[in-house]
């Protein structure tokens, strides 16, 4: 007997559905209804079909009581192929929901994405996470997808993007977005990371991730953000392969003084990077190839130094090695 | 069966930040359920502070939003609380408790507010 | 937010009476066929215990003693012949949408 496609905690917290079949039965998704977390994996379908059954054009003010009545605050949908149609008529039901998160990963979206009627409401999303979703309409997906979200948006995060740079003239400002998270698109390198950044776009930003993502110095890092008018307290530059040295012919650049936390653990360091800002209150550089202590001179001002798992911790090793860290738990680089 | 175990200091001064950690044992705090805050002062009812879900996802109680943080640990399966600039209001006993029909309680600790 | 009103705030009962405590919520707590609407029993000195989840399943571990009824906006926790040792504060709790709310309490005493 095939396992059953959905699965309700029994706390009524949980509810996934797997649909690996061809002709699956949506119909079993219904018991996801009382569910707060619902994930719903579509096994790489078409759901082209979708749009026959349905009316896109409907008026979704006839579903608000229905949709409303949902205890979902976190939906994550994957592994589909969604025309743009039936993702918007998706956004404008679940505008009437109490939905904050929503995750799209896996997802290929064809064709474009109308705009919004005026009578319309936006969803009220708090984060909004994307992963390996690529867009038919190319670099201008962020606008035509931002018009059907209300202004309140405090997460977004991009990976695996198939276009990571924006049309920044299209884009309009997020307010509220606190935290943006580019990590894992190691093509974008600082170049891309300029383009992604659009100017006076993202003026509240505290936290920004940039985790594999091909950035090559902290200087070319602090140059993006920079140009972009982007001043993060936090700014995540781990698992980088980053070079110390600057290039002399660079110019020198000035890190923003909200910038108080800076992670470049598992950067493939040999020495401390030049160019850091001058103060921070937090700064990780666990989980590199350092071979000696940092000289006083070579580091910012710091309350919080973390320098676990590089070599000259570690007697005997010439890599990054599981040994003694500063906090005195063992450390897994 | 799941067991839940508080712990961090009882006497907290004004103005400062309140942390408490919860301790899980029986159950994994990233593969299911809500793993909730919640506090009861001398003599009163209860009020619910906020979650943080097996997938990292936290929801908080708008009244204590802008003083609440809640994180995990998942490799050591703790979950923590964190309340900011503290007042004597804030005095009491504070539970973790898994699920949003709360089944599992810890046995609660005593935080009070006093300089 | 769904403020929960319990009553009476103090029940004053003797040993085998049957003690009736009531629920409202300022708005619906269901969701679909489900009310999410809970029951728990303090005492003194101790954290809550669960009693009834979704209006009317009773907890694995507690007498038969204990039920629940009702949906929407109206609950009822009714305890068929008291014990003793049901001297507690009884609170209810709704799921249904944070942020999460309890009912103020109902002091259950023995005479």
């Known amino acids: 007997t095939t396992p059953e496609p959905c699965e309700l905690d029994d706390e009524d917290f949980r509810c996934v559905c797997n649909f690996s079949e061809p002709q699956p039965d949506w119909s079993e998704a219904f018991q996801c209804v009382s569910a707060v977390e619902v994930e719903i994996h579509a096994g790489g379908l078409n759901l082209e079909p979708f749009l026959k059954r349905v009316d896109a054009d409907a008026d979704p003010r006839q579903y608000a009581d229905t949709v409303k009545a949902l205890r979902v605050r976190r939906l994550t949908v994957g592994a589909a192929q969604v025309p743009a149609q039936l993702l918007v008529g998706a956004l404008r039901v679940l505008a009437y929901s109490r939905l904050k998160e929503l995750t799209l990963e896996d997802l290929k979206i064809t064709g474009t994405m109308p705009p919004l009627p005026l009578e319309a409401t936006g969803l009220a999303l708090s984060s909004l996470r994307l992963r390996n979703v690529s867009w038919a309409t190319g670099r201008s997906w962020l606008a035509e997808l931002q018009q059907w979200l209300k202004p309140g948006l405090k997460v977004l995060s991009i990976a695996q993007a198939h276009s990571p740079a924006f049309s920044c003239e299209q884009v309009r400002a997020f307010p509220a977005l606190t935290s943006l998270d580019l990590s894992d698109n190691p093509g974008l390198g600082e170049r891309g990371l300029m383009a992604a950044l659009c100017p006076h776009k993202f003026p509240a930003i505290q936290n920004l991730a940039l985790r594999n993502t091909g950035m090559e110095t902290p200087t070319g890092v602090c140059a993006a953000l920079a140009a972009a008018g982007v001043q993060p307290h936090s700014l995540d530059l781990s698992h980088n392969s980053l070079r110390a040295t600057v290039n002399p012919s660079a110019p020198r650049c000035m890190w923003s003084s909200a910038l108080n936390s800076l992670n470049l653990s598992f950067a493939g360091l040999e020495q401390v990077p030049k160019g850091l800002p001058a103060k921070l209150r937090v700064l990780d550089l666990s989980c590199n190839r350092l071979n000696r202590a940092p000289q006083p001179d070579e580091l910012p001002e710091v309350d919080n130094l973390t320098l676990d798992g590089n070599p000259f911790l570690v007697p005997g090793t010439a890599l990054p090695h599981e040994g003694s860290m500063n906090s005195g738990v063992v450390p897994a680089c | 069966q799941v067991q839940l175990q508080e712990s961090g200091p009882g006497l907290v001064k004004p103005s400062e930040t309140l942390s408490l950690t919860c301790t899980v044992s029986g159950g994994s705090i990233s593969s299911d359920s809500a793993w909730n805050w919640i506090r009861q002062p001398p003599g009163k009812g209860l009020e619910w502070i906020g979650y943080i879900s097996y997938s990292g996802s936290t929801s908080y109680n708008p009244s204590l939003k802008s003083r609440v943080t809640i994180s995990r640990d998942t490799s050591k399966n703790q979950f923590s609380l964190k309340l900011s600039s503290v007042t004597a209001a804030d005095t009491a006993v504070y539970y973790c408790?898994?699920?949003?029909?709360?089944?599992?309680w810890g046995q609660g600790t005593l935080v009070t507010v006093s300089s | 937010e769904i403020v929960l009103t319990q009553s009476p705030a103090t029940l004053s009962l003797s040993p085998g009476e049957r003690a009736t405590l009531s629920c409202r919520a300022s708005?619906?707590?269901?969701?679909?066929?489900?009310?999410?609407l809970h029951w728990y029993q303090q005492k003194p000195g101790q954290a809550p215990r669960l009693l009834i989840y979704?209006?009317?399943n009773l907890q694995s571990g507690i007498p038969a003693r204990f039920s629940g009824s009702g949906s929407r906006t109206d609950f009822t926790l009714t305890i068929s012949s008291l014990e003793p040792e049901d001297v507690a504060v009884y609170y209810c709790q709704q799921s249904n949408e944070d942020p999460y709310t309890f009912g103020q309490g109902t002091k259950l005493e023995i005479k």
């Open positions: 408790v898994r699920g949003l029909r709360f089944a599992y």
């Open positions: 708005e619906s707590v269901d969701s679909y066929v489900n009310s999410f």
């Open positions: 979704r209006a009317s």
